[in-house]
């Protein structure tokens, strides 16, 4: 368990031409608030899909009234952090959507009017317990600057908040097999033993001996997939054999989503999928027009000239979604070579290379011999992320530092005697044989099987093998 924290630093006009209209005016003062939606993994999901990791709304910011003639400044922000608690392990990779909302404070009948000013989306990798990560995202002419982090709630620790820490029972050291808990060195990692047989994939425990099921699984050991097909009703009787959902009122009962929105349950509450032109937690907000700039990433907005007509975003290549807020999965083209893992970071593709490879697309087979010297005249041979030395005569070992015995393999044939020599070995041949390894017989008539002995050498002389 833990908390994802989001700190908004600024929201205002981005750099470059085409500064956005101020969202507030002297006639219609307004204030901002933010909504964050988190989803696990790096999936390309629709903005309307459930915020499976959780969602949060900020407080309302200070009331802002535009000063006539002044350029739109950074707008006043709500105080405090947006906090999204997560009950299970932190997934490490996540998708986020941050929406900036405007609340108009004029004399509207029926209370304040809400409208969506900007929505940014992204996908990131983040380890729990790490430092604040800073980010800048642009939506149309607006720019949002923010920081985020994930932190574990005690007693959980670790990059996924799955390890538990307990105060030390003894002041000096932890019990057998238990490690100190970094960064809480005065605490020890606690052994957490779930109920015997609890599914490691679909179950977890926060207390020893229990087995709690992830969404979609049921049964005492979380081994039964939830299925409503065999139930008497969509929320029929609970049974470990049928895997039916537990009875009782659900968060979507009565459909809390307005304006034709469809409701889907989340682990904590519900999520409304709104028809085009409606937004908000319950699809209660309407009136987004092309003038509000709802299309991101250079999308072209058509229609939606007035709040009663829907707009359509025509997305540029590489983007999709009702607001062009999602990137196409470019990694499906598998641009990384040599088994590298592709990561689509939005602004660029990155490849995580296997050992032995490097480069932006893992295209370089690392020079295994770089910086590796083979001693005594040996030469380095590359291969498969490791290096090997091919040693000169008389030397051996991984780096050719060991002096080899060239006579160990008995290289002299026909009873020749072997002598080690600085440049290799020398064979002293037995009578009747000659050659570097005494491999050639001398014919009885004195003629050699070789065309002729080298000058200065007589048959039977030791031959030096070079």
């Amino acid at each position: 368990a833990g908390v994802f924290e989001l700190q908004i630093h600024s929201f205002g006009p981005g750099p470059g031409p085409g500064a956005p209209r101020s969202p507030c005016s002297a006639r219609l003062p307004c204030r901002l608030f933010f909504r964050v939606c988190l989803k696990p993994g790096l999936s390309e999901e629709a903005a309307e899909s459930p915020c499976a990791l959780g969602a949060a709304l900020s407080a309302r910011g200070p009331v802002y009234t535009e000063q006539p003639g002044a350029p739109a400044p950074d707008l006043p922000l709500p105080d405090g952090l947006l906090q999204v608690p997560f009950r299970d392990a932190w997934p490490g990779t996540f998708s986020f959507i941050i929406e900036t909302w405007r609340e108009e404070l004029g004399d509207q009948i029926g209370g304040p009017a809400w409208s969506l000013l900007a929505r940014v989306a992204g996908r990131r990798r983040l380890a729990a317990g790490g430092p604040w990560a800073r980010d800048i995202q642009r939506a149309g002419a607006w720019e949002l600057r923010f920081s985020y982090r994930a932190r574990c709630e005690p007693p959980a620790v670790g990059t996924a908040c799955t390890r538990l820490c307990r105060p030390r029972s003894a002041p000096s050291r932890c019990g057998p097999g238990l490690r100190p808990c970094a960064p809480l060195e005065d605490e020890c990692e606690a052994p957490l033993v779930c109920r015997a047989g609890c599914s490691p994939e679909h179950g977890f425990c926060e207390q020893p001996g229990e087995c709690r099921c992830l969404e979609g699984w049921t049964g005492p050991l979380c081994t039964v997939p939830v299925s409503t097909s065999s139930c008497l009703s969509p929320r029929g009787p609970s049974s470990a054999t049928t895997g039916c959902l537990v009875p009782g009122p659900g968060p979507c009962d009565g459909n809390p989503c307005a304006n034709g929105g469809s409701c889907s349950e989340t682990p904590r509450s519900f999520e409304c999928t709104c028809p085009r032109g409606f937004y908000g937690l319950r699809c209660e907000v309407s009136g987004v027009t092309c003038a509000d700039g709802p299309c991101f990433n250079g999308g072209l907005c058509v229609g939606g000239a007035d709040p009663d007509s829907a707009y359509i975003c025509h997305c540029p290549p590489g983007f999709q979604g009702s607001n062009c807020e999602k990137r196409v999965d470019r990694c499906s083209l598998q641009p990384c070579r040599n088994g590298g893992l592709c990561l689509d970071l939005g602004h660029a593709l990155r490849c995580r290379c296997r050992a032995g490879f490097a480069g932006p697309r893992c295209e370089h087979d690392l020079d295994d011999c770089a910086g590796r010297a083979c001693a005594n005249g040996g030469t380095c041979v590359e291969g498969g992320g490791a290096h090997r030395c091919s040693c000169a005569l008389g030397f051996g070992g991984r780096d050719c530092r060991e002096r080899a015995d060239p006579c160990a393999a008995r290289p002299c044939a026909h009873g020749g005697r072997c002598y080690a020599h600085f440049s290799g070995l020398v064979c002293a041949c037995a009578p009747g044989y000659m050659g570097a390894r005494c491999e050639f017989p001398v014919h009885p008539d004195g003629a050699s099987a070789l065309p002729a002995a080298p000058p200065g050498l007589r048959p039977g002389d030791p031959q030096r093998y070079l």
Epitope: R330, L333, Q334, P335, R337, N338, L349, P360, R361, E363
Partner: nanobody
Framework: EVQLVESGGGEVQPGGSLRLSCAAS????????MGWYRQAPGKQRELVAG???????KYAESVKGRFTISRDNAKNTVYLQMSSLRAEDTAVYYC??????????????WGQGTLVTVKP
């Protein structure tokens, strides 16, 4: 800057064939990966066929045996031969390329798309 220009789209009857072409031009040092995506109305864009970074070919399950991707390295061009076309193949087909530029950076580029309509 790199441009991807697609051609060959059009209207065809079920069972018919079309051949799409995509030519890459600009400050290209090499083409690392190149292929075809498609997007039907209201659907996600999906990879249809491509040459991966390791130069192997990759096909979506739904087009295996019907579509064939080929390339002309000298012309920096890829082709998609589509046969036995079905109504569900109707979509805008986009060319995509992961390109190593002359400055050695890698960038991912998209074409503007060409419409393929399959109807009786």
């Amino acid at each position: 800057e790199v441009q991807l220009v697609e051609s060959g789209g059009g209207e065809v009857q079920p069972g018919g064939s079309l051949r799409l072409s995509c030519a890459a031009s600009g400050s290209i040092f090499s083409i690392n990966a190149m292929g075809w995506y498609r997007q039907a109305p209201g659907k996600q864009r999906e990879l249809v066929a491509g040459f991966t970074g390791d130069t192997s070919t990759k096909y979506a399950e739904s087009v295996k045996g019907r579509f064939t991707i080929s390339r002309d390295n000298a012309k920096n061009t890829v082709y998609l031969q589509m046969s036995s076309l079905r109504a569900e193949d109707t979509a805008v087909y986009y060319c995509a390329a992961d390109v190593q530029l002359l400055n050695s950076d890698y960038e991912f580029y998209w074409g503007q798309g060409t419409l393929v309509t399959v109807k009786p």
